[in-house]
Amino acid sequence: SPVPFGPEGRLEDKLHKPKATQTEVKPSVRFNLRTSKDPEHEGCYLSVGHSQPLEDCSFNMTAKTFFIIHGWTMSGIFENWLHKLVSALHTREKDANVVVVDWLPLAHQLYTDAVNNTRVVGHSIARMLDWLQEKDDFSLGNVHLIGYSLGAHVAGYAGNFVKGTVGRITGLDPAGPMFEGADIHKRLSPDDADFVDVLHTYTRSFGLSIGIQMPVGHIDIYPNGGDFQPGCGLNDVLGSIAYGTITEVVKCEHERAVHLFVDSLVNQDKPSFAFQCTDSNRFKKGICLSCRKNRCNNIGYNAKKMRKKRNSKMYLKTRAGMPFKVYHYQLKVHMFSYNNSGDTQPTLYITLYGSNADSQNLPLEIVEKIELNATNTFLVYTEEDLGDLLKMRLTWEGVAHSWYNLWNEFRNYLSQPSNPSRELYIRRIRVKSGETQRKVTFCTQDPTKSSISPGQELWFHKCQDGWKMKNKTSPFVNLA
């Protein structure tokens, strides 16, 4: 391994010895208090037992204190997300202390070695926190550890080892390999702080999951299902980011957690909300857009403390870049069938028309299959605030997209040559906004014209009985 370190996690600089007997021993973990928003500023290095730098660098004992903990590194340098996060924290919390935990020498190793070093780094942070607690006015409750990837588990160790309870730990896509399914004391867990919130952006059920799949906090948020992040596909990264390989797609998705957190700091006026759900598929079906019984929350820095919950999985959709906020809608569509539609799934799109803006043509994603003579639930989301919904247009795409659909069309035609047409009968669509929790029912203008076939469209307006509103005000007023 490229760094000589001893059992106590200390570096021995033997690269140049002026005297034959001299060996300079240095702590392998450094704490850099970022005293300026200027990323080039060298800041102040803090060390246990040395009070002078705290005074010299105006460490604010009564303010919030953030510890940013990086993860495994292949390059041995601080990546560019770090100064973005530092700057965002300074912008949002002007009086706060922002400390970067530099454990690069122990992280710039083989991954397995870096994993084995996480415990000693956690110990170092705990020792620093124990020392700071000896100072007047310093409160562990004001400490917020923010760990990315392997750094999230380092934060867990720190929270476990410290005397007392840290206020909050945020895990930004905690590392998966060697931690998935691990014992509660060998990874980040809800016991490590008063509140542990986690963002999962690179989880995979097949192949290697760079981020941990299992929930490890009080609330565990899985943006876009926790796997494929918009803007991180191979096509996207080849053209838009300084990445050109599969490994860079991985980096984009893994690091998305950091940018979602930064977004929550700097775009306060556009907070993203997540919704509790048992799994990603149910969320994709649009079943889980409820805010009752604390089933929804802000994501990132603005997350509301929910200590009664544990390993609560929450989901949301996002945009491809900042601001990441989207507006979620649940559509409940009762579908009757006039004519047998065979095995083919209809390709349906909806356009929402609002008082502020109109949406694009949004696909109704069929997660499993459409149930006929039943109410089907769909999730759609828009990138802009449409305002109050006024009307909507449902279209059934006429051309089959897949060979499977094409084959089924052909098979249906052969079995029913006299009646090849397919029709759905839809009289009303119930819409619920995730962000406002408002419910509105839309009806076809003419009840006699409620059928739709491939290549056709159907218009819906607010039903005559008007708005069906459960909540007059948004439940998020107290969350923001």
Partner: antibody, heavy 120, light 112 residues
Framework: QIQLVQSGPELKKPGETVKISCKAS????????MNWVKQAPGKGLKWMGW????????TYADDFKGRFAFSLETSASTAYLQINNFKNEDTATYFC?????????????WGQGTALTASS | DIVLTQSPASLAVSLGQRATISCKAS??????????MNWYQQKPGQPPKLLIY???NLKSGIPARFSGSGSGTDFTLNIHPVEEEDAATYYC??????????FGGGTKLEIK
């Protein structure tokens, strides 16, 4: 003020070993990374790699793996570049340049350069 | 590795006129709203001097006649109005997350 002062020019025979120094002053040496950059006569700049001045861990560009070694004498705020088995194509001016660990990694201060020439 | 191609290789500009130097990257050097492209000036017998960092930020102490622009893969250094002392070779450099940090081939500016 911030300064990077490099050792003087040298004439070297092929096969010899040469070690050039870069002494930093005006800032905390271990708080900034140190790069090495090569410039052959009449040619452009070529990044050789960098060394973490706190941990002593070097990183080399592909073309400079093997015969080149970065090292430190932290107590003297000095970085070193050693070239083993000196070759004709190593004739160039070598610059040290610092960068901030926490920033955007541009090279804000440079040494004056050390000219190495191969003597046949 | 990211390859930087500068053009032209050399140019001659009259005193007081505008000099424009281009740098094209083989892939984007943008990251989360910032472009990790820097510009340096080198005069004969001297080390390079940082002029512009992150595509458009002027280093303190550098005259305002130097300006940088661009994003993604296409970047430009402008000098206007050109002065006698600006005769030098100019290099672009990318410093994205993953080294190697590469330089362009250089553009030699002569004053007519």
């Amino acid at each position: 003020q911030i300064q990077l002062v490099q050792s003087g020019p040298e004439l070297k025979k092929p096969g010899e070993t040469v070690k050039i120094s870069c002494k930093a002053s005006g800032y905390t040496f271990t708080n900034y990374g140190m790069n090495w950059v090569k410039q052959a006569p009449g040619k452009g700049l070529k990044w050789m790699g960098w060394i973490n001045t706190y941990s002593g861990v070097p990183t080399y560009a592909d073309d400079f793996k093997g015969r080149f070694a970065f090292s430190l004498e932290t107590s003297a705020s000095t970085a070193y570049l050693q070239i083993n088995n000196f070759k004709n194509e190593d004739t160039a001016t070598y610059f040290c340049a610092r960068f901030s660990y926490y920033g955007r990694h541009y090279f804000d201060y440079w040494g004056q350069g050390t000219a190495l020439t191969a003597s046949s | 590795d990211i390859v930087l191609t500068q053009s032209p290789a050399s140019l001659a500009v009259s005193l007081g006129q505008r000099a424009t130097i281009s740098c094209k990257a083989s892939q984007s050097v943008d990251y989360d709203g910032d472009s990790y492209m820097n510009w340096y000036q080198q005069k004969p017998g001297q080390p390079p001097k940082l002029l512009i960092y992150a595509a458009s930020n002027l280093k303190s102490g550098i005259p305002a006649r130097f300006s940088g622009s661009g994003s993604g893969t296409d970047f430009t250094l402008n000098i206007h109005p050109v002065e006698e002392e600006d005769a030098a070779t100019y290099y672009c450099q990318q410093t994205t997350d993953d080294p190697p940090w590469t330089f362009g081939g250089g553009t030699k500016l002569e004053i007519k």
